[in-house]
């Protein structure tokens, strides 16, 4: 609970925010968890704490580990954990999966690629952008604020995009790179009122208390690339992100598949360590597009484990 993964490359700047939410201006103390050693706040140190931020300027492989942050007040301390991994720079062009941020999709109408984590840094425009390690050149590519815009997107534009920028700290400059995949959706086709393939309406799913459970919300929206189509889960009518139960998470990003030429999306709801109270919740699979919204409701019921007798 209250833990977040962060990663970076050696000799680059890495800035990590305390995963425990507080309000700005509160005192935040940082510790290296393995030794319980306090992280200094003096900026002359290579690794130092600055309020809710922990700064590695620059990062080293040996910095990898778990860092504890405590947001302090006289009556209520709040503790979070940042799991930091610093990797050696690759000699070849390939960016390994563990360095990739979430995949984004684009189409001819919408082709923005945001540079991940950039809001944590003190940077100035313009950003440099690379695709599969090649610097992007030509009028089709426009670096705008913290994102890249690609004009007249084609299927060939799919690939791994890296943003590179300079973080400035007290007059010293540090390089930062971040990579994410970009996929292109085809614009051909038509759209229909959403059709939910799974789950069935008012389905009862059997789960075992204490085990993990997955629910898949799958819907089709028409043929070809769909503009404004989404599937999502709600708990008791509330978005998963707003419901705030860390054990219950939607799989980040929506998987797109083409079934019999139809454009379909699915979203997996993962419930870790199923508890009794989960059986009382209403799970709604929502599919929506420009035509409207369709909802299928699922409820969980207890599955009694089969007794094994020798």
């Amino acid at each position: 609970k209250f833990s977040k993964q962060s990663w970076g490359l050696e000799n680059e700047a890495l800035i990590v925010r305390c995963p425990r939410q507080g309000k700005p201006s509160y005192t935040v103390d940082w510790y290296y968890s393995q030794t319980n050693k306090s992280i200094p706040t003096q900026e002359r140190n290579r690794v130092f704490a600055s309020g809710q931020l922990l700064k590695f300027l620059p990062a080293a492989v040996a910095d990898s580990g778990i860092y504890t942050c405590i947001v302090r007040s006289p009556t209520f301390n709040r503790t979070g954990y940042a799991n930091v991994t610093i990797y050696k720079k690759q000699s070849d062009c390939n960016v390994p999966d563990y360095l990739m941020y979430s995949t984004v999709s684009g189409s001819e109408k919408n082709s923005k690629i945001y540079c991940p984590t950039i809001d944590l840094y003190n940077w100035t425009a313009p950003l440099e952008w690379f695709k599969n390690c090649q610097a992007l050149q030509g009028s089709r590519y426009r670096a705008h604020k913290s994102f890249l815009v690609i004009d007249n997107v084609m299927t060939e534009d799919a690939g791994d995009y890296t943003c590179k920028f300079i973080h400035n700290e007290n007059g010293a400059n540090y390089s930062v790179t971040a990579t994410r995949s970009f996929t292109v959706k085809d614009e051909q086709g038509f759209s229909l009122f959403p059709v939910i393939g799974a789950p069935a309406q008012n389905e009862i799913k059997e789960v075992e208390i204490g085990k993990n459970a997955n629910l898949t919300c799958s819907a089709c929206f028409g043929k070809g690339t769909q503009f404004l189509a989404a599937v999502l889960w709600q708990l008791n009518g509330t978005k998963i992100t707003d419901f705030g139960e860390p054990r219950i998470q939607q799989e980040e990003g929506q998987n797109q598949s083409f079934s019999n030429g139809l454009a379909c999306l699915d979203m997996v709801l993962r419930i870790a360590d199923v508890k009794e109270e989960d059986l009382l919740l209403q799970y709604d699979c929502l599919a929506l597009n420009l035509h409207g919204l369709r909802r299928h409701t699922v409820r969980l019921s207890r599955k009694n484990p089969i007794d094994h007798h020798s």
Epitope: R20, Q21, G22, K23, Y26, F76, F243
Partner: antibody
Amino acid sequence: QVQLQESGPGLVKPSQTLSLTCTVSGYSITSDYAWNWIRQPPGKGLEWIGYIDYSGSTTYNPSLKSRVTISVDTSKNQFSLKLSSVTAADTAVYYCARTVIDSMDYWGQGTLVTVSS
Amino acid sequence: DIVLTQSPASLAVSPGQRATITCRASKSVSTSGHSYMHWYQQKPGQPPKLLIYLASNLESGVPARFSGSGSGTDFTLTINPVEANDAANYYCQHSREFPFTFGQGTKVEIK
């Protein structure tokens, strides 16, 4: 958006127990933060009653501690206030509110409880 | 318990003018470089709304006309310039220790 809503009887007889529930939507109360009860007698100022934090730990105002119980119902995403042996002095608007650290950033609309026979 | 005393009990201000409310604590509410004093606005029939936390930090979404200052035992909430919809009761609250306590309130009326 986080929302809090108080509910419970508007009239309680003297010496009985006042019971109120705060239903939270938009956030799971067991995920984080502290969840408070505050009251305000008609035309008067605010009095902090106590809170329960995300882990179930409670802290009460010593002036009310012997009569107060705050508990949580995780399955309904609710927390509750019980105030025993009430008198007319307990007549007030009762608010529930969320504390991120130690100021209260989200409040319910409040519910008036009158203690009268 | 820490007692918070607000003054004045009420004040009337013309739109465009400055309104100043003070809150005095019976003992210091400052420690470790922070002052654990917060300010709320309450309009009739509504719950309180957080304006300022840690003595001087503006809560998200609150207009910059509101500002807070002070440390130790003496704190001030300033509204400048006052607008017609600022008519309300204003309360200070400390969180230096348990129990949290509030001031008795200051009623701001608009002339």
